[in-house]
């Protein structure tokens, strides 16, 4: 049987001779050279050679455990004479023994990390890691310990874990933002003779909101003309904040002062400036100077820094309103007036008033813009603004008159303003009802009494547009001895009825019926309309067959004896 255990070989042998590994030996070997030892497997004949007579194995090259820690070979012992094995082929191991020949290497040459400024001592920043290629299972060659070479007293590193933490209270980004920390990793548990490696950690303090906004000056002054419309920017103010990003964002607001309702402040998001704008119309004559208290504040505040004081600042803004020569101002934006359509010429409808808003209080004169009143229906007293009629009105022609009145400063005619006047013409019952159409009808010669031959309808131009109450009757001059009667249907219609049995067209071919139509409005209006009734020959169904055409062609000589 074979007589060996596993072989151990120290790595990185630096001797001049081959490094002795060990000896293969069979108990069949009598030392007479009859056995031959053969080596095969990992590195056999190259890395490892064997004396075929003695079984001594030697390493021909310097070995590196970190490259290959174990070699597996096979041993044979054969009888030189017969060539037969005297032992079964057997596998054996050569284990490379570690020495501390590798320094720790960090996973990154340079680390970058951030940590909020003003963090508590011991706040985690980053973890660095170094690895050592030596054998961790044997000795301390691979036992790494971390230490800080550069970066104290600001940061510390945990020796076992490589965790870097803050080590100093109140580190202020606004004082210093960047730190370069050098960390060493040393093997042999940090003992003397251990190998080491280093890495650089670039640490940036990130901003927190630990600084309030501050106005660079306590008072600002701006000027604006009184004519500035709402929304006009009149000046910019800027507070500075040592922080950055959203921690440096500023919101401006007006917190006090007589101009609280008159001005606004808006924040320019790009420049972080406060823009003072006009909110309401200014009037130099009412107020010439306004003061505002403007506050700049951080919208995002960290409660833990509130002990540092309020995260806002205020400044006084003085706004001087400049005088502008203004046109007259009417007491209303528009005037709505009413007048009855039966108003006589020179009837006063109402009046307008305008005043020069300037301190000078220049007198004004009034006029009607004739482009809006081409027919000169209305006029105005240039001195007191009274509007009066200069022509008769008719609601049925025009219900609304829309005119423009101009007020002009007498001393400065360039300064003028205009106002619309809407004049409603109120209805008066000044139109009589009349027939809705021209009525020309016929009656059959053989008609019976009380037969309906025509229904009459009426219209009235006055109000109400619908809902009139009309009455119909024969005119007094035709009422007695009439051949026809009017039946008022009480629904704004009336019927013409025959009053006798039979009509003779040769005796009387056409009747003219005067009908009086009246409304029941005030004052009552009435008109007389004439209905033409022709006498015609009809068939037994009452359909007209023939009438005297001459009755239509020659109206002279027609009887009105209806």
């Amino acid at each position: 049987s074979w007589m060996w255990n596993q072989f151990f070989l120290l790595e990185e042998y630096t001797g001049s001779d081959y490094q002795y590994v060990g000896k293969l030996h069979s108990d069949q070997d009598r030392g007479d050279g009859s056995l031959k030892y053969i080596l095969s497997g990992d590195g056999a004949g190259d890395l490892f050679i064997i004396n075929e007579n003695t079984g001594d194995i030697q390493a021909t090259k310097r070995l590196d455990r970190e490259e290959k820690p174990v070699y597996i070979l096979r041993a044979q012992a054969i009888n030189r004479r017969t060539g037969r094995p005297v032992e079964p082929e057997s596998e054996f191991i050569i284990k490379i023994h570690d020495i501390n020949d590798n320094e720790p290497i960090f996973t990154k040459e340079v680390y970058t990390a951030t940590v909020p400024e003003m963090s508590d001592v011991g706040t985690f920043v980053v973890q660095v890691t170094a690895t050592d290629a030596d054998d961790p299972t044997y000795g301390n060659s691979a036992k790494v310990v971390y230490s800080i070479l550069q970066g104290q007293p600001y940061f510390s590193v945990e020796s076992e874990t490589g965790i870097i933490k803050t080590a100093l209270l109140n580190m202020d980004r606004e004082n210093r933002e960047q730190y370069q920390v050098v960390i060493q990793a040393k093997d042999m548990g940090g003992q003397m003779g251990g190998l080491s490696g280093t890495t650089t950690v670039n640490i940036t303090l990130t901003d927190v909101n630990d600084n309030p906004p501050r106005f660079p000056q306590s008072t600002y002054q701006f000027k604006t003309p009184e004519s500035s419309p709402p929304g006009t920017p009149i000046g910019r103010i800027k507070a500075s904040d040592a922080d950055v990003g959203e921690n440096a964002e500023i919101e401006y607001s007006i917190t006090d002062g007589e101009g609280l309702d008159m001005f606004d402040v808006i924040t320019d998001q790009e420049t972080q400036e406060g823009i003072i704008t006009v909110k309401k119309l200014l009037d130099f004559e009412k107020k010439k100077v306004y003061t505002l208290k403007v506050e700049a504040s951080n919208p995002y505040v960290e409660p833990r820094f509130l002990y540092l004081g309020p995260f806002k600042d205020s400044a006084t803004v003085r706004i001087v309103v400049e005088d502008v020569d203004e046109p007259p101002v009417f007491s209303k934006l528009a005037y709505i007036l009413q007048i009855r359509e039966d108003a006589q010429i020179n009837t006063t409808i109402g009046s307008v008033t305008a005043q020069d808003p300037d301190a000078a209080r220049n007198p004004v004169k009034y006029s009607v813009d004739r482009h809006t009143d081409m027919d000169r229906i209305f006029n105005i007293d240039s001195g007191n603004g009274s509007i009066f009629t200069s022509k008769l009105l008719d609601r049925e022609t025009l219900l609304w008159h829309n005119i423009t009145v101009i007020a002009t400063e007498i001393n400065n005619p360039k300064q003028s303003s205009r106002v619309p006047l809407y004049i409603k013409v109120l209805d008066v019952n000044d139109n009589a009802p009349e027939f809705a159409e021209f009525y020309e009808t016929f009656v059959c010669e053989k008609a019976k009494a009380d037969q309906l031959i025509q229904t009459l309808h009426a219209v009235d131009k006055d109000d109400p547009y619908s809902g009139h109450q009309f009455s119909f009757s024969l005119a007094p001059e035709a009422a007695s001895g009439s051949n026809f009667t009017i039946q008022d249907n009480k629904d704004n219609t009336a019927g013409i009825l025959t009053r006798k049995n039979g009509y003779n067209r040769h005796e009387m071919s056409t009747y003219l019926l005067p009908v009086v139509i009246s409304d029941n409005d005030y004052p009552v209006q009435s008109s007389t309309g004439t209905v033409t009734v022709r006498v015609c020959a009809c068939d037994h169904h009452g359909n007209m067959q023939s009438c005297h055409a001459e009755a239509l062609i020659h109206p002279t000589g027609l009887s009105t004896g209806a």
């Epitope: 009413q338 009855r340 109120l426 209805d427 008066v428 019952n429 109000d463 109400p464 619908s466 809902g467 009139h468 109450q469 009455s471 009757s473 005119a475 007094p476 009422a479 009086v516 009246s518 409304d519 029941n520 409005d521 005030y522 004052p523 009552v524 009435s526």
Partner: antibody, heavy 116, light 107 residues
Framework: QVQLLESGGGLVQPGGSLRLSCAAS????????MSWVRQAPGKGLEWVSV????????YYADSVKGRFTISRDNSKNTLYLQMNSLRAEDTAVYYC?????????WGQGTLVTVSS | DIQMTQSPSSLSASVGDRVTITCRAS??????LNWYQQKPGKAPKLLIY???TLQSGVPSRFSGSGSGTDFTLTISSLQPEDFATYYC?????????FGQGTKVEIK
């Protein structure tokens, strides 16, 4: 059916004021002229005032002109008569009536007595 | 103002009688005349408008005629419910005026 109902009458001292109302129903109130007619105790009828359908025009008897004001609220179907500076001769039953020329419907009347 | 004069001021009649009341205007009023009936403690009621047009719901025994200045109200056959005071009214021109009334009593 057409109904007119007056209210607001009563005893008032000379120089005093009173406001009569007339609630209308059963017809399109806004389409009709409306009138007030009065009747002194044991006397005949006297036309007092009329207002057109839209309320745009009003007319008065000379005896009440400047003292009485007729008005209407078409949204409430109501006619009014505001009577100021009342005199003893204004004592009467006041009727509201539909129409501007002939009065086809009348209310039951409300008595106004002017007396010290 | 136009004066309206009714005659007679009062009359006594029996049921079934034909009754005629006249109304005269101080100037021509064409056909713009109305007739009203009033019973004690009640509101007036329109009988006839435009001189001769019968108001809806009014019995046909009532009729009106005339134009200009002279007008007539006729009750062809007097009924018990017709005993009342009758008024004429012109609406030709403002102010509209009433006659002094005609009282029809039972004989």
């Amino acid at each position: 059916q057409v109904q007119l109902l007056e209210s607001g009458g009563g005893l008032v001292q000379p120089g005093g004021s009173l406001r009569l109302s007339c609630a209308a129903s059963g017809f399109t109130f806004s389409s009709y002229a409306m009138s007030w007619v009065r009747q002194a105790p044991g006397k005949g009828l006297e036309w007092v005032s009329v207002i057109r359908s839209s309320g745009s025009s009003t007319y008065y008897a000379d005896s009440v002109k400047g003292r009485f004001t007729i008005s209407r609220d078409n949204s409430k179907n109501t006619l009014y008569l505001q009577m100021n500076s009342l005199r003893a001769e204004d004592t009467a039953v006041y009727y509201c009536a539909r129409g501007g020329g002939y009065f086809d419907y009348w209310g039951q009347g409300t008595l106004v007595t002017v007396s010290s | 103002d136009i004066q309206m004069t009714q005659s007679p001021s009062s009359l006594s009649a029996s049921v079934g009688d034909r009754v005629t009341i006249t109304c005269r205007a101080s100037q021509s009023i064409s056909l713009w005349l109305n007739w009203y009936q009033q019973k004690p403690g009640k509101a007036p009621k329109l009988l006839i408008y435009a001189a001769s047009t019968l108001q809806s719901g009014v019995p046909s025994r009532f009729s009106g005629s005339g134009s200009g200045t002279d007008f007539t109200l006729t009750i062809s056959s007097l009924q018990p419910e017709d005993f009342a005071t009758y008024y004429c009214q012109q609406y030709y021109t403002s102010p509209y005026t009433f006659g002094q009334g005609t009282k029809v009593e039972i004989k």
